[in-house]
Amino acid sequence: EPPTACREKQYLINSQCCSLCQPGQKLVSDCTEFTETECLPCSESEFLDTWNRETRCHQHKYCDPNLGLQVQQKGTSETDTICTCEEGLHCTSESCESCVPHRSCLPGFGVKQIATGVSDTICEPCPVGFFSNVSSAFEKCRPWTSCETKDLVVQQAGTNKTDVVCGPQDRQRA
């Protein structure tokens, strides 16, 4: 009775259960009752990352420098190349097919999380007591100057975009 289903890491072909090719190898010829599945290693620029019956290996991803990409991890016969973005850029998608410049946080906003090769800058509004007067991809909100610690008084209140302005205390006349 020919099988209708096969074990794990096998496939059904013409009423016969054949072993799948291991990761890093492609199928050359199906098995027979007398011969094992014939598999061949993928070439240097190719890979297969699963147990498979593919007759062609997949090409490694190309990290195109014209798109701001660079190699993060070189591919093997069993893994694809992993691309990341050059300094100052991040991926536009999870598959990282192209890069865009990191976002800068506008005045009134500070950097909550600095961008990486795969994620953009995360900005946050400067809370009361903090400010940012620059457009920056790495500067956090800075605290207002404490006039008191300098024996000065606030002459002009701070905002989320400006620091306080300190000045000398008015001397009381005797």
């Epitope: 013409n14 010829s29 199906d30 098995c31 027979t32 009752e33 007398f34 011969t35 094992e36 014939e38």
Partner: antibody, heavy 117, light 109 residues
């Protein structure tokens, strides 16, 4: 390169025995089934026997069943055909051939067996 | 046992002509497991076609196989001098035995 080389042929009297060998090189011999196919002078091809890659399964043509035995030694990359009780009609060139799902893709050059008194 | 009948027994043609060889099976050949071999005098057979229509490695595209079930054809589109030989079909679906056809000799006219 991938190669099969038969040896052991010769002239033998009816009723006697002969052992043919087939030396394999250039491929993983222990992963392939192997066949013996023969060709009588001026005639067509006749399949004789097959053995599975690990030597467990063996099938024979009715014309040789009970007289011929196919075997293999994977450590020596060699296929054998033990031929007993030889008859005049066993006179032929004997070829070994590699089994695949694509048919017999590699053949040896053949060895001549002549059964004559 | 599947019996394979090849026709014609001999085909006399000139170089450049088209050759059509037939192989008929006594019952259906499962999965089209039918191969064609070429044999020249004093040489071992050489695999040309497998699975009824797939060319083996290194075989020129003037050789083509077709058919399924019980009727199969080997076509040589334009005969080259080196193509004059004997051609055998073989089924490897239903065994034992693996059976060969009787052969077709393609000779120079």
């Amino acid at each position: 390169q991938v190669q099969l080389v038969e040896s052991g042929g010769g002239v033998v009297q009816p009723g006697r025995s002969l052992r043919l060998s087939c030396a394999a090189s250039g491929f993983t011999f222990g992963s392939y089934g192997m066949h013996w196919v023969r060709q009588a002078p001026g005639k067509g091809l006749e399949w004789v026997a097959v053995i599975s890659y690990e030597g467990v399964k063996k099938y024979y043509a009715d014309s040789v069943k009970g007289r011929f035995t196919i075997s293999r030694d994977n450590s020596k990359n060699t296929l054998y055909l033990q031929m007993n009780s030889l008859r005049a009609e066993d006179t032929a060139v004997y070829y070994c051939a590699r089994d695949t799902s694509r048919g017999h893709d590699i053949w040896g050059q053949g060895t001549m067996v002549t059964v004559s008194s | 046992e599947i019996v394979l009948t090849q026709s014609p027994g001999t085909l006399s043609l000139s170089p450049g002509e088209r050759a059509t060889l037939s192989c008929r099976a006594s019952q259906s050949v499962s999965y089209d497991y039918l191969a064609w071999y070429q044999q020249k005098p004093g040489q071992a057979p050489r695999l040309l076609i497998y699975g009824a229509s797939a060319r083996a490695n290194g075989i020129p595209d003037r050789f083509s196989g077709s058919g399924s079930g019980t009727d199969f054809t080997l076509t040589i589109s334009r005969l080259e001098p080196e193509d004059f030989a004997v051609y055998y079909c073989q089924q490897y679906a239903d065994y034992p035995p693996f059976t060969f056809g009787g052969g077709t000799k393609v000779e120079i006219k």
